[in-house]
Interface confidence: medium
């Protein structure tokens, strides 16, 4: 399997009750506006064929896409949570900037591309769904990167 390097986040990033709560509240607000409950972005299909040792790298890709293609364009919505959560997630992204995989990551890119395609296909409702799954993104980063 490909070897991942520098794919680690300090536990302290996930031990801040205030920002944890704000992240989950943002997800809740967005999920209330999400009518498409049959589609799941962060779930079994995203993780399929990706070992746990590669999972942090996978979640880094999802985090970067979510920030650049979803949260930044939607930054005026879901206040006051958005203005607090986006900088927090951006810091996590920055701390994972040196997280790379040595070897073939095609299987990971394929899974991430499916997520991206789903969000794009759904348009604005796809972006809302991605924000509504920030709790899963947060938990998956915690699970994979510590």
């Amino acid at each position: 399997a490909p070897i991942s390097s520098h794919c680690r986040l300090d536990k302290s990033n996930f031990q801040q009750p205030y920002i944890t709560n704000r992240t989950f509240m943002l997800a809740k607000e967005a999920s209330l506006a999400d009518n498409n409950t049959d589609v799941r972005l962060i779930g079994e299909k995203l993780f399929h064929g990706v070992s746990m040792s590669e999972r942090c790298y996978l979640m880094k890709q999802v985090l970067n896409f979510t920030l650049e293609e979803v949260l930044f364009p939607q930054s005026d919505r879901f206040q006051p949570y958005m203005q607090e959560v986006v900088p927090f997630l951006a810091r996590l992204s920055n701390r994972l900037s040196t997280c790379h995989i040595e070897g073939d990551d095609l299987h990971i890119q394929r899974n991430v591309q499916k997520l991206k395609d789903t969000v794009k296909k759904l348009g604005e409702s796809g972006e809302i769904k991605a924000i509504g799954e920030l709790d899963l993104l947060f938990m998956s980063l915690r699970n994979a990167c510590i």
Partner: antibody, heavy 121, light 110 residues
């Protein structure tokens, strides 16, 4: 076939210690978060503790925090629960449980049959 | 984290539909889509029948369905069968990284 087999239960006096083990087979152990869940005789389920794939995050119910320690040895496909300062209310059948899919340990899709812990003087 | 609230018992006749409720708080059921349901027959280990509010594991009958509204999650069993008689537990993952279970509901098929 996924199999989880618990061991290490028994009768212990209040204040005593026990170490439970869970031997896992039939799946790639280090791809999954794992949990311990207990059930007192005739009572409901109570989550005790959970650990992520590499032991980096360990979470506990308030009722056992500071007394119990969860750990895992991925080379041995084993999960452990070290229980110290045991109390009568810790008496229960202790189940080892695996997440249904590897991204979410809290969806406990596979369970062992349990090992009985009795705390009594 | 307090236990989630479920009715102690429900009953129904074969072929009927029944619903079991699971009421939590804004810190668990109300906030996150991490609700699971388990079926437990006497002397057996629990079995996952619903996860992430409304997803069914492979092999679980489509007679079982889950939903959530506000702080309350629900499990509906349609076309009740004798083998559905069991204890049912809901659970929710929380923002404190813990899992909380409901007290359990005994389903009797009349």
């Amino acid at each position: 076939e996924v199999q989880l087999v618990e061991s290490g239960g028994g009768v212990v006096r209040p204040g005593g210690s026990l170490r439970l083990s869970c031997a896992a087979s039939g799946f790639t152990f280090d791809d999954y978060g794992m949990n311990w869940v207990r059930q007192a005789p005739g009572k409901g389920l109570e989550w005790v503790s959970g650990v992520n794939w590499n032991g980096g995050t360990r979470d506990y119910a308030a009722s056992v925090k500071g007394r119990f320690t969860i750990s895992r040895d991925n080379a041995k496909n084993s999960l452990y629960l070290q229980m110290n300062s045991l109390r009568a209310e810790d008496t229960a059948l202790y189940h080892c449980a695996r997440g249904w899919y590897s991204g979410a340990a809290w969806n406990m899709g596979y369970w062992g049959r349990g090992t009985l812990v009795t705390v009594s003087s | 984290q307090a236990a989630l609230t479920q009715p102690a018992s429900v009953s129904g006749s074969p072929g009927q539909s029944i619903t079991i409720s699971c009421t939590g708080a804004s810190g668990d059921v109300g906030a996150y889509n991490f609700v699971s349901w388990y079926q437990q027959h006497p002397g057996k280990a629990p079995k996952l029948i619903i996860y992430d509010v409304n997803k069914r594991p492979s092999g679980v009958s489509n007679r079982f369905s889950g939903s959530k509204s506000g702080n309350t999650a629900s499990l509906t069993i349609s076309g009740l069968q004798a083998e559905d008689e069991a204890d049912y537990y809901c659970s929710s993952y929380t923002s404190t990284f813990s899992v909380v279970f409901g007290g359990g509901t005994k389903l009797t098929v009349l």
